[in-house]
Interface confidence: low
């Protein structure tokens, strides 16, 4: 950055190089150039000359004042107008940053995704700090009292092999940057209670021609967990409200769930599971689309391309339509 330049003087910032966003700041420039009593001192921000709020303090020093500085980052440098050098001479430069101290991390959550081999811990970091903010995740065994610390910029994956202190732990997160430090509440976990089963996936759908047409959704998971509770939610794509069905599931075979749906309507389905009685759910699966046939059942092709229709001779309408969802906000 600009801090690597060779200086012929000194540039400094008050109150500090990293400061709270919205503060009034002063940038000082002091020339120390051989054979130069500067005629003028100039300040540049991101390469653009500043024209206002510059005060000459003495023969070699000037101050640039900013009110309510709101830029997260800026490169500042100053120059001297040295007549005998025939040109502007660089004095020095500095990268400055403004932002906020970290909020207290909350909603600390640790889960073990089945087969991942990791415990994944996340938290709500709060408002954007704009400046480099580091997080230290503390993991303390309640059985051995041994504590491990993990430095990260966001979430953390901790190998379950490194969790040698039994099954019970305290987890908390410390957030720190140049403007402050905060610590979350402690989360108590039991490793057996935080496992999330392997993802459940909807594979296909078909509508069976019967007195009342019936739609069957086929779905599965690779989980080895015996007792699993699942939810499937569905709605017409034109609706805002989801309908939810609950299942106690054994994934030794592909699951088939039956729904009685309106004809000639496009529906969307998602599924999620948890180990029965435990705290955390999977994120919802990717969106699965299925359009029910008109009264004579029809076959649907992959969703979100145009819907193609075959002749009315088929006995079932089959969908294999997926669209990846963003899966936000689904743990817990």
């Amino acid at each position: 950055g600009i801090t690597n330049i060779n200086c012929s003087g000194h540039i400094w910032v008050e109150p500090a190089t990293i400061f709270k966003m919205g503060m009034n700041i002063s940038i000082y420039c002091q020339a120390a150039i051989k054979n130069c009593q500067p005629r003028k001192l100039h300040f540049y921000k991101n390469g653009i000359k500043e024209r206002f709020q510059i005060t000459r303090i003495n023969k070699t020093t000037a101050r640039l004042w900013y009110k309510n500085f709101l830029e997260p980052h800026a490169s500042m440098y100053c120059t001297a107008e040295c007549p005998k050098h025939f040109q502007e001479t660089l004095i020095c430069g500095k990268d400055i940053s403004s932002g906020y101290p970290p909020d207290i991390p909350d909603e600390v959550t640790c889960v073990i995704y089945e087969y991942s081999g990791n415990m994944t811990c996340t938290w709500n970091a709060g408002k954007l700090t704009y400046i480099d903010t580091k997080y230290v995740v503390h993991v303390k065994s309640l059985e051995t009292e041994e504590e491990q610390q993990y430095l990260t910029s966001s979430y953390i994956n901790i190998s379950t092999d490194s969790l040698q202190g039994g099954k019970k732990y305290l987890v908390w997160v410390q957030a720190a940057n140049a403007l402050g430090m905060e610590e979350s509440k402690q989360l108590q976990i039991h490793l057996d209670d935080i496992v999330i089963p392997s993802a459940a996936v909807i594979s296909r759908a078909e509508t069976i021609n019967a007195t009342v047409p019936k739609t069957i959704i086929y779905w599965d998971s690779q989980t080895t967990i015996e007792k699993v509770s699942c939810e499937m939610r569905y709605k017409a794509t034109t609706n805002q409200t989801w309908n939810v069905k609950e299942f106690d599931t054994n994934f030794t075979y592909v699951q088939q769930s039956e729904f009685y749906l309106e004809p000639n309507i496009k529906y969307v389905f998602q599924v999620r599971c948890q180990e029965t009685g435990k705290r955390y759910w999977q994120p919802w699966s990717s969106l699965f689309f299925h359009k029910t046939p008109e009264t004579v059942p029809q076959v649907t092709s992959k969703a979100f391309q145009h819907d193609t229709w075959n002749s009315g001779l088929t006995v079932a309408s089959i969908s294999t339509g997926h669209l990846t969802s963003d899966n936000r906000g689904d743990i817990g």
Epitope: N35, R39, R51, T79, P83, K84, F86, Q87
Partner: antibody
Framework: QVTLKESGPGILQPSQTLSLTCTFS??????????VGWIRQPSGKGLEWLAN???????YYNPSLKNRLTISKDTSNNQAFLKITNVDTADTATYYC????????????????????WGQGASVTVSS | DIVMTQSPTSMSISLGDRVTMNCKAS??????VDWYQQKTGQSPKLLIY???NRYTGVPDRFTGSGSGTDFTFTISNMQAEDLSVYYC?????????FGSGTKLEIK
């Protein structure tokens, strides 16, 4: 109106000291940022910068001649001087003095210093 | 020292021609190049300063451009009174140095 005029001996012999005077008007060498320079030009050849003197008596010399050159000024009489010791036939040339001044480049750009006014030149011949 | 290599050394031109000459610095001089005109028997006169700025009273047929190491001086419509030698000079660092000059002659 800015004018500069050089004066010198015209002819001198090798090993002697050349003394040149620049008398100027229309500006003052006591003004911050003002300078006077000396430049020479052998007949039919190019220009060679010799030395500058600034308002604060700071001096700059061409390294190739530095140990033979002395620049000075008399601010009150609006004069600048150049001495060249131990002259040789290679010092035969027309010697110019010139003003160096700042030219404003706009509110967001620093002034630019340029050799903007020259004297008519003083012809100097070194001959035995 | 910074060497200013000026080209061509001389040019034979006709009145009304567009005339272009170049100056190449041996190292980066930013925009700190000036152009001077010297008529026979006279002292040099400043035409262009800081690469592209016309000095007071200089006709707009004279233009300059360039930065870094490569600079160009152009006369867009050659007049009889423009027959001269033209010099570039760098004022980026001491010692100040001049190009060797470009002499304009009539064909």
């Amino acid at each position: 109106q800015v004018t500069l005029k050089e004066s010198g001996p015209g002819i001198l012999q090798p090993s002697q000291t050349l003394s040149l005077t620049c008398t100027f008007s229309g500006f003052s060498l006591s003004t911050y940022g003002m300078g006077v320079g000396w430049i020479r030009q052998p007949s039919g050849k190019g220009l060679e910068w010799l030395a500058n003197i600034w308002w604060d008596d700071d001096k700059y010399y061409n390294p190739s001649l530095k140990n033979r050159l002395t620049i000075s000024k008399d601010t009150s009489n609006n004069q600048a001087f150049l001495k060249i010791t131990n002259v040789d036939t290679a010092d035969t040339a027309t010697y110019y003095c010139a003003r160096i001044d700042a030219h404003p480049m706009g509110i967001t750009t620093p002034d630019y210093y340029v050799v903007d006014a020259w004297g008519q030149g003083a012809s100097v011949t070194v001959s035995s | 020292d910074i060497v200013m290599t000026q080209s061509p050394t001389s040019m034979s031109i006709s009145l009304g021609d567009r005339v272009t000459m170049n100056c190449k610095a041996s190292q980066n001089v930013g925009s700190n190049v000036d152009w001077y005109q010297q008529k026979t028997g006279q002292s040099p006169k400043l035409l262009i300063y800081k690469a592209s700025n016309r000095y007071t009273g200089v006709p707009d047929r004279f233009t300059g451009s360039g930065s870094g190491t490569d600079f160009t001086f152009t006369i867009s419509n050659m007049q009889a009174e423009d027959l001269s030698v033209y010099y570039c000079m760098q004022s980026n660092s001491y010692p100040l140095t001049f190009g060797s000059g470009t002499k304009l002659e009539i064909k």
